[in-house]
């Protein structure tokens, strides 16, 4: 038994990192396989992480963690039964991959403009909490090529767009994700999407 | 309410051996590292010991290496410090102290102080 | 091992000043790991800030931390009769737990 593809791993910089390799056949994961992490830390304890299989010789596993800092560096051992098979390390602050927001609404009701809110998905306390930007994605049920993407460089969780930037009587759905710059992150994944209905008067024409 | 409670501290002679024994109480003691640091008569504080949550790490400051044992009993939630060839220099108030890892080693609960007197 | 040194020993100040407590580490640290403390004669110690700048449960919002590198300090915005006390700085690293030998401070 040998790993093909060595672990990697990301870190939502709050309580999970996930890491991920692969075997160089089938294997179950679960039965097979253990990843022990300990953090680079006086008197602190290693951790057992029951891998879950991710395709036939894909594993992967979520190391549980109490709360993270930029300084912490873990120690990462992958063991089948008595044998090591792979020995590393890895810094949670250099290999960020930040949580999806939550809670995304579509305010309908503010004269003809849409305010889209959703919440960050840090607690205050988080180091990434005053950190996150996002990217809004809203698209056409109707019209694949009705495709756009509002960066939101500022720090509050919503965007105000003109309603008549889209079309009328049409359905349109949004998602948003985040990433901060100060940890050079990966983008999160997409929000679940929310959809609603476009309507807005047509300006009056004179002819 | 969270506390350490110290206890096993006296008069002892040079050379001679003391046990002391910390209770904890509104916690689990198992999810913790815990430590002893110690403050000699009017001055500043000294780490002296520390073990892991399960036991199985250990930690000695080079002062007291050889001499000092640090040990915890989970089940019954108790932390000890088992010293022995003890010198005058070892006289102190002994501190048990609690570890919250998310603190990355800012000691949030500490017991009241024992005091060990070594002198003949 | 990194060694820790208080400036000043000690610091006369009155009710209603702001005191700025300074911590030297011999060698560049970890601000994750560096802690301070606040002890009243008679009593054990009570954790103030932790991982430089963050303050512990209950604490009040006059003090603060800060610093990086070598240089921490702790920042009492405007002191309190209470807060006359000793202050202690504290590194817990990969491998061992320094504490600074202390900063007394006094009402002048």
């Known amino acids: 038994m040998k790993v093909l593809q060595e672990p990697t791993c990301v870190s939502d910089y709050m309580s999970i990192s996930t890491c991920e390799w692969k075997m160089n056949g089938p294997t179950n994961c679960s039965t097979e396989l253990r990843l022990l992490y300990q953090l680079v830390f006086l008197l602190s304890e290693a951790h057992t992480c029951i891998p879950e299989n991710n395709g036939g010789a894909g594993c992967v596993c979520h190391l549980l963690m109490d709360d993270v800092v930029s300084a912490d560096n873990y120690t990462l051992d992958l063991w089948a039964g008595q044998q090591l098979l792979w020995k590393g390390s890895f810094k949670p602050s250099e290999h960020v991959k930040p949580r999806a927001p939550g809670n995304l609404t579509v305010h309908t009701n503010v004269s003809d403009t849409l305010l889209l809110t959703w919440s960050n998905p840090y607690p205050p306390d988080n180091y990434l909490y005053n950190h996150l930007t996002y990217a809004v994605n809203i698209w056409s049920e109707n019209d694949p090529a009705d495709f756009r993407i509002y960066n939101v460089t500022y720090l509050e969780p919503s965007l105000r767009i003109a309603a008549s930037t889209l079309k009328s009587g049409i359905s349109y759905r949004a998602r948003v994700r985040a990433w901060a710059q100060c940890y050079n992150t990966t983008w999160s994944e997409w929000s679940p999407s929310t959809k609603w209905h476009n309507s807005y008067r047509e300006p009056f024409e004179q002819h | 309410e969270v506390q350490l409670l110290e206890s096993g501290g006296g008069l002892v002679q040079p050379g001679g051996s003391l046990r002391l024994s910390c209770a904890a109480s509104?916690?689990?003691?198992?999810?913790?590292?815990m430590h002893w640091v110690r403050q000699a008569p009017g001055k500043g504080l000294e780490y002296v010991s520390g073990?892991?949550?399960?036991?199985?790490?250990?930690y000695y400051a080079n002062s007291v290496k050889g001499r000092f044992t640090i040990s915890r009993d989970n089940p019954k939630n108790t932390l000890f410090l088992q010293m022995s060839s003890l010198r005058a220099e070892d006289t102190a108030v002994y501190y048990c102290?609690?570890?919250?890892?998310?603190?990355?080693?800012?000691?949030?609960?500490w017991g009241q102080g024992t005091t060990v007197t070594v002198s003949s | 091992e990194t060694t820790l040194t208080q400036s000043p020993d000690t610091l006369p100040l009155s009710p209603g000043d702001r005191a700025s407590l300074s911590c030297r580490a011999s060698?560049?640290?970890?601000?994750?790991?560096l802690a301070w403390y606040q002890q009243k004669p008679g009593q054990a110690p009570r954790l103030l800030i932790y991982?430089?700048?963050r303050r512990a449960t209950g604490v009040p919002g006059r003090f603060s931390g800060s610093g990086s590198g070598t240089d921490f300090t702790l920042t009492i915005s405007r002191l309190e009769p209470e807060d006359f006390a000793v202050y202690y700085c504290?590194?817990?690293?990969?491998?061992?737990?320094?504490f600074g030998q202390g900063t007394k401070l006094e009402i002048k």
């Open positions: 991982g430089t700048s």
């Open positions: 504290q590194l817990y690293g990969s491998s061992s737990v320094t």
């Open positions: 073990i892991s949550s399960n036991g199985g790490s250990t």
């Open positions: 509104g916690f689990t003691l198992s999810s913790y590292a």
């Open positions: 102290v609690r570890v919250k890892v998310g603190y990355r080693g800012g000691m949030d609960v």
């Open positions: 060698q560049s640290v970890s601000s994750a790991y």
